[in-house]
Structure formats: structure tokens, C-alpha cells
């Protein structure tokens, strides 16, 4: 029996050098969210604890910003940021809910096709 549902931004794309907001939303449950962990594949990016607030992993401090809300903002995107991201909600009394987002970082269209738009 699964009571809650996680809605995510799903599959998203963004341009290299830009930023993107990763968002998850837990609905259909009255459970209390005690902590949300954000992971990139097999790396912990950030933790938002209901009592202690945000902690960003040191290796991502320069490029990851907390929020908005329980979401996460990735900045200065590189092609290496392409991949799976997981929001992991720990709740009381239900347990743990996990959402998945796939991010594809594309080469900047301006950089790629810049010559086409040059004014003679």
C-alpha cells in the first residue's frame, strides 16, 4: 500500500553554462517530511533537514544552491552534469519516498550556431 506520491520535473534539458531548478513535490499523504536528500546518480549533493536546515556537499558548494523550497538549483552546468538525479524524502510515519529526474545538458545553441546569427 503506497499512500503518497512524488511528482517531479521529469526529463528536462538545459544549456551548458546555464542553471536549472530540480523540483520534487510529495502529495497525497499527511506524513511529515523530516529530511530530503538530493543525489546525483551515486553522489550526495545536498540535504535539507527539517530541524537543521540545508547542507550542501563540499564538492558541490560552488555550483549548487538550496531551493526554491525543498528543490535544488544547479548552476554553471557542464555536459558532465547530464544524468539521473534523485530526491529522497524521509517522512514520519510513512517512510521514504524517492523521485527521479533525468537532466540532459546540451551545448549552448548560441555557441554552437553563433556564426549563423552574425550581422554582416
Amino acid at each position: 500500500m503506497m499512500t503518497g506520491t512524488i511528482e517531479t520535473t521529469g526529463n528536462i534539458s538545459a544549456e551548458k553554462g546555464g542553471s536549472i531548478i530540480l523540483q520534487c513535490h510529495l502529495s497525497s499523504t499527511t506524513a511529515q517530511v523530516t529530511q530530503v536528500n538530493w543525489e546525483q546518480q551515486d553522489q550526495l549533493l545536498a540535504i535539507c533537514n527539517a530541524d537543521l536546515g540545508w547542507h550542501i556537499s563540499p564538492s558541490f558548494k560552488d555550483r549548487v544552491a538550496p531551493g526554491p523550497g525543498l528543490g535544488l538549483t544547479l548552476q554553471s552546468l557542464t555536459v558532465n552534469d547530464t544524468g539521473e538525479y534523485f530526491c529522497i524524502y524521509h517522512t514520519y510515519p510513512d517512510g521514504t519516498y524517492t523521485g527521479r529526474i533525468f537532466l540532459e545538458v546540451l551545448e549552448s545553441s548560441v555557441a554552437e550556431h553563433g556564426a549563423r546569427f552574425q550581422i554582416p
Epitope: 503518497g4 510513512d94 521514504t96 519516498y97
Partner: nanobody, 127 residues
């Protein structure tokens, strides 16, 4: 094929302790949802404790209200083993204890539906 084998059950006086173990084979995912359930005679099987872990370092344990503060679920990743440490046992904790694993990690909690089950180990607490 996932296989779960429990051990550690037995008889104990009220107030005593037991530690159950569950060795898993064939369950090698980067995200895992495992749990302990129990069934007393004439009653439905109920969730006791669950553990969500990921290779990214997330470790979230969840407990039924009836055991919170007395039972602790933990793991030894290297041994593919999950444990249930049971302290201050009460006669109402008696029953067959089952280890379980869930394929999907979209939800991991005592009320989740689990896919794989062990054969169970008997715990008897006398007053």
C-alpha cells in the same frame, strides 16, 4: 533471483534482547529497500521496520509505532546483511519475523508492498 535467509530467533524473557539477521543474495542494486515484518498467531503480518539505503550515502530507517525506541534496523553492506536489534522485548512482540526486500524504491516503509520474502524465524517472549 533474490534469496533472503533469516536467523537469530529464539525464546527470551520479557525485557530481554535478540538480534535477527537476514542475509540477501541476488539483491545488488544501488538503491535498496529492505524490511522486517512479523506475524503473530491469528493476526495479519505487519511491518516492523524498514531501511532505505543508496550508494550515494542515504540511510533512512522507519519504524512501526509499537517498536520505535526499542528496535533498531541496520545493515552490513559488505556482508549483504540487514539486522534487527530488539531490546526490551514484550510478550506482544512474539511471532514469526520475516525479512523482506522491495524491487522498487519509489516508496519504502512498513506499509509498502514487498516483492521478496524470507522463510521467517520464530521469536517467543515469555512473561
Amino acid at each position: 533471483q533474490v534469496q533472503l535467509v533469516e536467523s537469530g530467533g529464539g525464546s527470551v524473557q520479557a525485557g530481554g534482547s535478540l538480534r535477527l539477521s537476514c542475509v540477501a543474495s541476488g539483491y545488488t542494486y544501488s538503491r535498496k529497500c529492505r524490511g522486517w515484518f512479523r506475524q503473530a498467531p491469528g493476526k495479519e503480518r505487519e511491518g516492523v521496520a524498514t531501511l532505505y539505503t543508496s550508494s550515494g550515502g542515504t540511510y533512512f530507517d522507519t519504524y512501526a509505532d509499537s517498536v520505535r525506541g526499542r528496535f533498531t534496523i541496520s545493515q552490513d553492506n559488505a556482508k549483504n546483511t540487514v539486522y534487527l536489534q530488539m531490546n526490551n522485548l514484550k510478550p506482544e512482540d512474539s511471532g514469526i519475523y520475516y525479512c523482506a526486500a522491495r524491487l522498487s524504491t519509489d516508496f519504502c516503509g512498513p506499509r509498502a508492498d514487498f516483492d521478496y520474502w524470507g522463510q521467517g524465524t520464530q521469536v517467543t517472549v515469555s512473561s
